[in-house]
C-alpha cells in the first residue's frame, strides 16, 4: 500500500521515529554504494547523517557518482539487468562511485502503489544528495541518476527536490501508465537535469504501453521506431512456445533500454547513432539521417548534451544483440518513368557491395507508395561495416509473396487481360550513410539499360564524379 | 564464516505438508536473499523461489506458486520453505541458498534436508 | 522459461587432462551463467558466476566463457577431487533454471 504520509513527507524521518515500543523501523530505502565488482560483496549502506560509511567504503568525493534507480518489480529479488549495469559502470568509469537505489520494500506492490511511492523515494534520494553537497568536494554536476521503468520518475522526483540541479537523468523506458500526458512536475522532463537523455523501447500506440510514448527528456531516443524490438517476437523469445508467455516478450522490449545503455558502456568502439525526426514513419522513409545541426548523436552514456528549446525525438535501428550497432543508409531512387504499373506496390530488394564487406539482401520497405517522375526515399541498414560503396544491386522480386498481391494481380489482369508486363525506368541511385554523412550517386552499368521489371535486376556502380561531401560533419569525428 | 543449518529429515505422508528451516550466521541475514533448491533423486536441481529478507518479499517458481510459502523470522536469522499438498513426487533433498548482492548465484548452501513422501 | 542444455550427460577424461564442458541456454542470457560443482551426498559448490568470474577458495584451474546462449567450463589439469558432476544455472528470468548435469567420470 502507499506510503502512508503527505507528498512532502520525509521517508526517514517517518521512518526513524522511534515507536513507543523503541522498535527499530526499517528504512524503506536503501542506497547501496557498490565497492566491488564482486556481486558477493555486501557493497556499503549509507545513510543521511552517518559520516563513517563514505570513509570505510572509499567513496570518491571528486569523482561521478551514479544512482541506479529499479522500477516496480512483480519480485522481491532484484532483476538480472542490475547486475549487468552496474558492472558496465565500474568498468567503464572505474574511480566513479556507483550507488544503487533499493526501494524494493516500496517497489513490489500494486503497481498504482508503487507510483504512489514514487515522490517520496525521489525525495529520499534528494535527500541523500542534499547531505552529500554538504561535503566538500562533492558537486551534484557529477551526479547521473539512471532511472529504469517506474525508477525514471523517481528519479525526475529526486531532480525536482534536490537543491540545485544534478548533472544528468538518464530515463531508461520510463514508465507509460499513470504518467503519459502528466504535468511536467509529476513525471520526467527535462527541467529535472542539467542534461535528461531518455530511450524508449516498449511504446505501444494501442493496447496498454509500458513504457512512455511522449518525449520526456532533452533527448528521446525510440530506437526501431520505439515498439518493436527486434529479437524480442514471440519465436525469438519463447524459443519453444510451451517454456514462456507473453511476459517475456514484454521483458524483453521493455529492459532493452537497460541492454541498449550496458552496451554504450561497455561498446564504445561501437557506437550506435541517432537521427532526429519528427515521427518513425519518416525515418522509415530514409528521410532522415542528416548530423547537421545537431541533429544526430550517440545513445545511451556516450549522448552529447543537448538542451534544447524542443524536445528532440530521435531514432535509429538496432541489432537484436549486442553489440547493437547498425550502419544507417538513406537510398534515395528516381523513378522516371513506368509502366502498367497496376495497383501492386513493387518489392524491391537492395544488396550493397563495399570495399569491406558486401550485405546480406536487404528489402526496401516501401512506407506509403513508389511516386513516378520522383524521387522516392529509402532506409536500409546493415549490420556490418560495409567500407566504401562499390556498387549496388537492385532486384525486383518476381513471384507475389502474399495471398493479398496475388488477388490484386488477378484483378489487374481481370481489367488488363493483355498486361504488356510491368517496368521502372531507374537511372541511378544516391546513397548517403548516415554513420559517416558521405553521399554517393550510382548510375546504370549500362547506360542504356535502365528498365527493370518482376524477377529482374539492375546494377548500379559508382558514377564518374564519386563521392560527394556537402558540409555535414560525421557523427564519428564529432561525438566522443 | 558463513553457515546455512538445516533442519532434520522428514518423513510425510502425502497430503500432508512439512516446513523447512535455514538458520543462517556469518553474515547480515537481511542483506542478502535466501533460496530454496531441491533435488529428486537422480534429477537435475530445481530452484523453487527466494525470499528479500528485509522486508519478507518473495518470488516463486510458478511450477510450486500454489503449494509453497517462504517466510523468514529477522530475528532469529532463518528462513523457512513450507510445502503442501505433498505427494510421491515431493520426494527430494531440499536445499537453502544464499543469493549473491542481486540474488542470481549461490555461494553458500545449507546442507540439505531430506523430504520423504510415503503412504 | 528458459532452458539450460548440458548435451553431454557423461564425459570420461584421465587425471592431468583438460575437461571441456558445455552448457547452452535456450535463449539469449548475456552473462547471467553460473557453475556448480556436487559430489555425492554433499551440497552443490559454486565454481564460476556470471560465466567467466572466478570465486575465491575456487583452484584457478577451473574457468569459465561464453555469452549468449553457448557457455563452456573448462578444468585445465584435472586432479582427482575433480570428478563430480557439474551443472550450469542460469539467472537471466525466473524461474531460474539449471541444466540436467554432466558427470566428469575417470577414464
Known amino acids: 500500500s502507499p506510503v502512508p504520509f503527505g507528498p512532502e513527507g520525509r521517508l526517514e524521518d517517518k521512518l526513524h521515529k522511534p515507536k513507543a515500543t523503541q522498535t527499530e523501523v526499517k528504512p524503506s530505502v536503501r542506497f547501496n554504494l557498490r565497492t566491488s565488482k564482486d556481486p558477493e560483496h555486501e557493497g556499503c549502506y549509507l545513510s543521511v547523517g552517518h559520516s563513517q560509511p563514505l570513509e570505510d567504503c572509499s567513496f570518491n568525493m571528486t569523482a561521478k557518482t551514479f544512482f541506479i534507480i529499479h522500477g516496480w518489480t512483480m519480485s522481491g529479488i532484484f532483476e538480472n539487468w542490475l547486475h549487468k549495469l552496474v558492472s558496465a559502470l565500474h568498468t567503464r568509469e572505474k574511480d566513479a562511485n556507483v550507488v544503487v537505489v533499493d526501494w524494493l520494500p516500496l517497489a513490489h506492490q500494486l503497481y498504482t502503489d508503487a507510483v504512489n511511492n514514487t515522490r517520496v523515494v525521489g525525495h529520499s534520494i534528494a535527500r541523500m544528495l542534499d547531505w552529500l553537497q554538504e561535503k566538500d568536494d562533492f558537486s551534484l554536476g557529477n551526479v547521473h541518476l539512471i532511472g529504469y521503468s517506474l525508477g525514471a520518475h523517481v528519479a525526475g522526483y529526486a531532480g525536482n527536490f534536490v537543491k540545485g540541479t544534478v548533472g544528468r537523468i538518464t530515463g531508461l523506458d520510463p514508465a507509460g501508465p499513470m504518467f503519459e500526458g502528466a504535468d511536467i512536475h509529476k513525471r520526467l522532463s527535462p527541467d529535472d537535469a542539467d542534461f535528461v537523455d531518455v530511450l524508449h523501447t516498449y511504446t505501444r500506440s494501442f493496447g496498454l504501453s509500458i513504457g512512455i510514448q511522449m518525449p520526456v527528456g532533452h533527448i528521446d531516443i525510440y530506437p526501431n521506431g520505439g515498439d518493436f524490438q527486434p529479437g524480442c517476437g514471440l519465436n525469438d523469445v519463447l524459443g519453444s512456445i510451451a517454456y514462456g508467455t507473453i511476459t517475456e516478450v514484454v521483458k524483453c522490449e521493455h529492459e532493452r533500454a537497460v541492454h541498449l545503455f550496458v552496451d554504450s558502456l561497455v561498446n564504445q568502439d561501437k557506437p550506435s547513432f541517432a537521427f532526429q525526426c519528427t515521427d518513425s514513419n519518416r525515418f522509415k522513409k530514409g528521410i532522415c539521417l542528416s548530423c547537421r545541426k545537431n541533429r544526430c548523436n550517440s545513445i545511451g552514456y556516450n549522448a552529447k548534451k543537448m538542451r534544447n528549446k524542443r524536445n528532440s525525438k530521435m531514432y535509429l535501428k538496432t541489432r537484436a544483440g549486442m553489440p547493437f550497432r547498425v550502419y544507417h543508409y538513406q537510398m534515395k531512387i528516381h523513378v522516371f518513368s513506368y509502366k502498367n504499373m497496376g495497383e501492386i506496390e513493387p518489392t524491391f530488394y537492395v544488396t550493397l557491395y563495399g570495399t569491406n564487406a558486401d550485405s546480406q539482401t536487404l528489402p526496401l520497405e516501401i512506407v506509403e507508395r513508389i511516386e513516378q517522375n520522383a524521387t522516392n526515399t529509402f532506409l536500409v541498414y546493415t549490420e556490418e561495416d560495409l567500407g566504401d560503396l562499390l556498387k549496388i544491386q537492385l532486384t525486383w522480386e518476381g513471384a507475389s509473396q502474399s495471398w493479398y498481391n496475388l488477388w490484386k494481380e488477378f484483378r489487374s489482369y481481370l481489367s488488363q487481360p493483355r498486361n504488356p508486363g510491368r517496368e521502372l525506368n531507374i537511372r541511378r541511385i544516391r546513397v548517403k550513410s548516415g554513420e559517416t554523412q558521405r553521399k554517393l550517386t550510382f548510375c546504370t552499368e549500362d547506360p542504356e539499360n535502365t528498365s527493370i521489371s518482376p524477377g529482374r535486376e539492375l546494377w548500379f556502380r559508382k558514377c564518374r564524379d564519386g563521392w560527394r561531401m556537402k558540409n555535414e560533419t560525421s557523427p564519428t569525428v564529432e561525438l566522443p | 564464516q558463513v553457515q546455512l543449518v538445516q533442519s532434520g529429515a522428514e518423513v510425510k505422508k502425502p497430503g500432508a505438508s512439512v516446513k523447512v528451516s535455514c538458520k543462517a550466521s556469518?553474515?547480515?541475514?537481511?542483506?542478502?536473499?535466501m533460496h530454496w533448491v531441491r533435488q529428486a533423486p537422480g534429477q537435475r536441481l530445481e530452484w523453487m523461489g527466494g525470499i528479500n529478507p528485509y522486508y519478507g518479499g518473495t518470488t516463486y517458481n510458478e511450477k510450486f506458486k500454489d503449494r509453497v510459502t517462504i517466510t523468514r523470522d529477522t530475528s532469529a536469522s532463518t528462513a523457512y520453505m513450507e510445502l503442501s499438498s505433498l505427494r510421491s513426487e515431493d520426494t527430494a533433498v531440499y536445499y537453502c541458498?544464499?543469493?549473491?548482492?542481486?540474488?542470481?548465484?549461490?555461494?553458500?548452501w545449507g546442507q540439505g534436508t531430506t523430504v520423504t513422501v510415503s503412504s | 522459461e528458459i532452458v539450460m542444455t548440458q548435451s553431454l550427460a557423461t564425459l570420461s577424461v584421465s587425471p592431468g587432462e583438460r575437461a571441456t564442458l558445455s552448457c547452452r541456454a535456450s535463449?539469449?542470457?548475456?552473462?547471467?551463467l553460473h557453475w556448480y560443482q556436487q559430489k555425492p551426498g554433499q551440497a552443490p559448490r559454486l565454481l564460476i558466476y556470471y560465466a567467466s568470474q572466478s570465486i575465491s577458495g575456487i583452484p584457478a584451474r577451473f574457468s569459465g566463457s561464453g555469452s549468449g546462449t553457448e557457455f563452456t567450463l573448462t578444468i585445465s589439469s584435472l586432479q582427482s577431487e575433480d570428478f563430480a558432476v557439474y551443472y550450469c544455472q542460469q539467472s537471466n528470468s525466473w524461474p531460474y533454471t539449471f541444466g540436467q548435469g554432466t558427470k566428469l567420470e575417470i577414464k
Open positions: 541458498a544464499k543469493g549473491d548482492y542481486y540474488g542470481g548465484s549461490y555461494n553458500y
Open positions: 535463449q539469449d542470457i548475456s552473462n547471467s
Open positions: 556469518g553474515y547480515t541475514f537481511t542483506d542478502y536473499t
